[in-house]
Amino acid sequence: YDFTNCDFEKIKAAYLSTISKDLITYMSGTKSTEFNNTVSCSNRPHCLTEIQSLTFNPTAGCASLAKEMFAMKTKAALAIWCPGYSETQINATQAMKKRRKRKVTTNKCLEQVSQLQGLWRRFNRPLLKQQ
């Protein structure tokens, strides 16, 4: 999906009002020195591409993020504010339902959510673009 035509300000508002707080709740109890962010993004569409990938694509050691509250709210925000996004996700959602697993918070998931927080920071304030 090409995130170029999303309403970035509306997505930012959704993130700051609720999603960010859900991410903080998920990370509560984790030391702030524990993880080193290695995933980066250069502009808002790129940030959303990386955010979508980390939030919804199962990875080795962390298969369950898509069912977390912050993920469901992220999906809703993208569906509302990115034209045509929901249509592209129908097949992916059906595939995910087939491999539904019980929620487990692993260290790998915590690391992935730490990466997500970093990506959202850059989405909210791209450093090199004059916005």
């Epitope: 903080i24 702030s32 080193n36 980066s40 959202w120 920071r121 450093l127 090199l128």
Partner: antibody, heavy 119, light 107 residues
Framework: EVQLVQSGAEVKKPGSSVKVSCKAS????????IEWVRQAPGQGLEWIGV????????NYNENFKGRATLTADKSTSTAYIELSSLRSEDTAVYYC????????????WGQGTTVTVSS | DIVMTQSPDSLAVSLGERATINCKAS??????VTWYQQKPGQSPKLLIY???EHYTGVPDRFSGSGSGTDFTLTISSLQAEDVAVYYC?????????FGQGTKLEIK
């Protein structure tokens, strides 16, 4: 606990340079932007620029381009600002600050470093 | 550059009364406004981000509102420890810019 500790006060001659350090602790240094802000005596706050310690990317206020250089040393979790061609108007308290968890504000600030430029 | 203009420059309010500080941007900054408090001899402290979101540990008597070009910081019931200079800041476009500050005193 997140802390930003800055180097001590400096007195400099016009035309010279100054380098101020900002040592971060209590969080992963490379994960958060470091901002630099200054405050002239009795005046308001002026943004100088920002650096991403993770990759060295910077963005400067045009008013300081060419005179201010922001750097970061990941091995010591320390950010630096160097200001060259100093003039009396550069007399100010220089602050480093960290971006907050959302990227939309500065949540932790250093204690400030007073730089006095005088002949 | 976006100019942030605060009003008034200084304000004297009785203890327990409401204090209101305004901030006007020279062009729309969406909701990208932050408020800081600075007490004499101290570094600034974050109060409110993204117009109205409270930073951790900031008392509920502080609130922010507005959008576009006009923003307000309100202290619902002034306490002695609220004496400080208050700054608005926009982070909508580079360079980031601050208001000139509003000095809040007790009447």
């Amino acid at each position: 606990e997140v802390q930003l500790v800055q180097s001590g006060a400096e007195v400099k001659k016009p035309g010279s340079s100054v380098k101020v350090s900002c040592k971060a602790s209590g969080y992963t240094f490379s994960n958060y932007l470091i901002e630099w802000v200054r405050q002239a005596p009795g005046q308001g706050l002026e943004w100088i620029g920002v650096i991403d310690p993770g990759n060295g990317d910077t963005n400067y206020n045009e008013n300081f381009k060419g005179r201010a250089t922001l750097t970061a040393d990941k091995s010591t979790s320390t950010a630096y600002i160097e200001l060259s061609s100093l003039r009396s108007e550069d007399t100010a308290v220089y602050y480093c600050a960290r971006e907050d968890n959302t990227g939309t504000a500065f949540d932790y600030w250093g204690q400030g470093t007073t730089v006095t430029v005088s002949s | 550059d976006i100019v942030m203009t605060q009003s008034p420059d200084s304000l004297a309010v009785s203890l327990g009364e409401r204090a209101t500080i305004n901030c006007k941007a020279s062009q729309s900054v969406s909701s990208d406004v932050t408020w800081y408090q600075q007490k004499p001899g101290q570094s600034p402290k974050l109060l409110i981000y993204y117009v109205s979101e409270h930073y951790t540990g900031v008392p509920d008597r502080f609130s922010g509102s507005g959008s576009g070009t006009d923003f307000t910081l309100t202290i619902s019931s002034l306490q002695a420890e609220d004496v400080a200079v208050y700054y608005c800041q926009q982070h909508h476009r580079f360079p980031l810019t601050f208001g000139q500050g509003t000095k809040l005193e007790i009447k």
